[in-house]
Interface confidence: low
């Protein structure tokens, strides 16, 4: 018994005065606690606890289940204990079959012995199977067998406590070890869509998928910069032992513009946290925004091709698209397609393919698009660049030489005089009058220019050249004339087209 200095409270004394007592099944257990301030006896084994306020604990016919720790406590809270083994050859183990172990921690297989004098107290695999090679354990007859550093691989391991009795191996009831995995990585979180665009009154629903090794992972939906608790629903599955999946679905049944914002799905475990966000934009009504991919004023050479391309945002989805020219709708030559196959895509592309454009095909080309809420349009002004064409070249009754040319951009007309039979006309002649004839008309067709010179200025035989040119090319017309005495011969015009 412990000895203490006089004056200090001392723990109670127990008779018999030993730490362990072995009795046979059916025998009497008689324990006496001596202390002036006796309070109670407490008996503990596995999860069972009994109390007795008598200072003498008597069990007339001991059973194996009376094996355990008997503790006497006094009013000072000081105590003394004796451990009693009730030896029963038919019941060598007391068992609590629940067996849970946390990965990397120790866990106790609770199979205390009723007889401390049996030998080879250990663990054995079920049905003759060997235990995992790396499984280490420490036996304690009063508590059970401690498995050291539980591994994930031990999950669902079936085992028995075992002792040798009279040369034979005796097994306890079987235990199935359930391993609770340790978190060795942050949860994996993903969201059904990264962004949502809705009209007022539509339902917003987004699902966050959380994956981890066990269901004890924590998860929640949060609104950024807000503490409001969001309503969410859960579904969960165990795909095998250490593969847990939870789906947390957040729903706003009738979204409003002020619900717009960033929503975060947050998950954490003892290792760390992870999050993923989704953006909600709620608009009061739908919209269409058109972005031309080329300049809306287009210059193209005669006979060449041009593609008119627009990108547009449409929400809700576009319902009608068309390209129009001169009040006529194109039935072909155009295509319309989503910019991406992403489910949340709102951006589209429309292309009109104009091929081998003629000078007469310039004008306004309009793209129109509509959805259930709005209409929108964009116009392209297409100018077809054409080489000048000399429409008329005449000597007028008043003696003027007149040249009329058409083309786009507006042609310039220069006049040249070639004396005698020279092929090259170099001396330029200033026109008397220059007019753009149809400048008040539509701006997309060819522009017509008229230029006149006074033929009376010419005193010698020769050729007069009218040359019309612009950025695209040039064309010439010629007037041949000769003097007979004092009179000019009839002037014979002819043209020479210069590429």
């Amino acid at each position: 018994q412990p000895s203490v200095s006089p004056g200090e409270p001392s723990p109670p004394s127990i008779h018999p005065g030993k730490s362990d007592l072995i009795v046979r099944v059916g025998d009497e257990i008689r324990l006496l606690c001596t202390d002036p301030g006796f309070v109670k006896w407490t008996f503990e084994i596995l999860d069972e606890t009994n109390e007795n306020k008598q200072n003498e604990w008597i069990t007339e016919k001991a059973e194996a289940t009376n094996t355990g720790k008997y503790t006497c406590t006094n009013k000072h809270g000081l105590s003394n204990s004796i451990y009693v083994f009730v030896r029963d050859p038919a019941k060598l183990f007391l068992v609590d079959r629940s067996l849970y172990g946390k990965e990397d921690n120790d866990t106790l297989v609770r199979c205390p012995l009723t007889d401390p004098e049996v030998t080879n107290y250990s663990l054995k695999g079920c049905q003759g199977k060997p235990l995992p090679k790396d499984l280490r354990f420490i036996p304690d007859p009063k508590a059970g067998i401690m498995i050291k550093s539980v591994k994930r691989a031990y999950h669902r391991l079936c085992l028995h406590c075992s002792v040798d009795q009279e040369g034979k191996s005796v097994l306890s009831e079987k235990f199935i070890l359930k391993v609770r995995p340790a978190f060795k990585a942050v949860p994996v979180v993903s969201v059904s869509k990264a962004s949502y665009l809705l009209r007022e009154g539509e339902e917003f629903t987004v699902t966050c998928t959380i994956k981890d090794v066990s269901s004890s992972v924590y998860s929640t939906w949060k609104r950024e910069n807000s503490q409001t608790k969001l309503q969410e629903k859960y579904n969960s599955w165990h795909h095998g032992d250490f593969n847990y999946e939870r789906q947390a679905t957040l729903t706003i049944s009738s979204a409003r513009v002020n619900d717009s914002g960033v929503f975060m799905c947050y998950a954490n475990n003892t290792f760390g946290s992870a999050n993923v966000t989704t953006t909600l934009e709620v608009v009061d009504k739908g919209f269409i925004n058109i972005f031309p991919m080329i300049n809306t004023t287009v210059f193209v050479n005669d006979g060449e091709n041009v593609d008119l391309i627009v990108e547009y945002e449409a929400f809700p989805k576009p319902e009608h698209q068309q390209w129009i020219y001169m009040n006529r709708t194109f039935t072909d030559k155009w295509e319309d397609y989503p910019k991406s196959e992403n489910e949340s895509n709102i951006r589209y592309v429309s292309e009109l393919h104009l091929t081998r454009l003629k000078g007469t095909e310039g004008g306004t080309y309009t793209f129109l698009v509509s959805n259930s809420d709005v209409n929108a349009a964009i116009a392209f002004n297409v100018y077809v660049n054409t080489k000048p064409e000399i429409l008329t070249y005449d000597r007028l009754v008043n003696g003027m030489l007149q040249c009329v040319a058409a083309g786009f951009p507006e042609p310039t007309i220069d006049w040249y005089f070639c004396p005698g039979t020279e092929q090259r006309c170099s001396a330029s002649v200033l026109p008397v009058d220059v007019q753009t004839l149809n400048s008040s008309g539509p701006p997309f067709g060819k522009l017509v220019v008229q230029s006149s010179i006074d033929s009376s200025a010419f005193k010698h035989n020769g050729t007069v050249e009218c040359k019309a040119y612009n950025d695209v090319g040039k064309t010439s017309a010629y007037f041949n004339f000769a003097f007979k005495g004092n009179n000019k011969e009839q002037i014979h015009p002819h043209t020479l087209f210069t590429p």
Partner: antibody, heavy 122, light 106 residues
């Protein structure tokens, strides 16, 4: 769901052979002892044979030891019973059963198949 | 070999009755006794193992008792679904079954 499903039995001639199989699902087949138990029409149950988890130990009813062979394929989750030199008294419903145990060497059969009927007759 | 005897081959009882079925072993089987239920369609189910331990999923109206060579199965409140044949089985030395007791409704 833990299930044991025996193969189709049938009618066989005396002195011929037959192999029964039992497909297990819903549990780790290789963790359990397995057994065959039979029932003669309108009679009681009779244990036929047992096999340990990896097939290294087998046990038979003495009177059947020379004619019946129990085996297993853990990769396929199948238990077999090869019966040879069949006699009319082997006519019975044959059940496949899973063995579990309590304590040291004390056995019980905790999951049973639905049984398959073997008729030995000329 | 250990022989198992169920002296009562058939038994009639009314719904709600307390029914006891007995089984005797030819030698001491150290409580290594199990009870099985076989329904009319041939389906076999474990009810009780190690004399008195109830298999999971079995209704608590079933109980077992006994020691040495004499054992019994009790159904405390007979229900329609309990109509079946009941077999005892020893697990002391290899495995052997009793002849069965067929339970019928009066």
């Amino acid at each position: 769901e833990v299930r044991l499903v025996e193969s189709e039995g049938g009618l066989v001639q005396p002195r011929s052979s037959m192999k029964l199989s039992c497909t297990a699902s819903g549990f780790t087949f290789s963790d359990y002892y397995m057994a065959w138990v039979r029932q003669v029409p309108e009679k009681g149950l009779e244990w036929v044979a047992n096999i340990n988890y990896d097939g290294s130990s087998t046990y038979y009813l003495d009177s059947l030891k020379s004619r019946f062979i129990i085996s297993r394929d853990n990769a396929k989750n199948i238990l077999y019973l090869q019966m040879s030199s069949l006699k009319s008294e082997d006519t019975a419903t044959y059940y496949c059963a899973r063995g579990d145990y309590y304590g040291t060497t004390y056995w019980y059969f905790d999951v049973w198949g639905t049984g398959t009927t073997v008729t030995v007759s000329s | 070999d250990i022989q198992m005897t169920q002296t009562t081959s058939s038994l009639s009882a009314s719904l709600g009755d307390r029914v006891t079925i007995s089984c005797r072993a030819s030698q001491d089987i150290s409580n290594y006794l199990n009870w099985y239920q076989q329904k009319p369609d041939g389906t076999v189910k474990l009810l009780i193992y190690y004399t008195s331990r109830l298999q999971s999923g079995v209704p608590s109206r079933f109980s077992g008792s006994g020691s040495g060579t004499d054992y019994s199965l009790t159904i405390s409140n007979l229900e329609q679904e309990d109509i079946a044949t009941y077999f005892c089985q020893q697990g002391k030395k290899l495995w052997s079954f009793g002849g069965g007791t067929k339970l019928e409704i009066k």
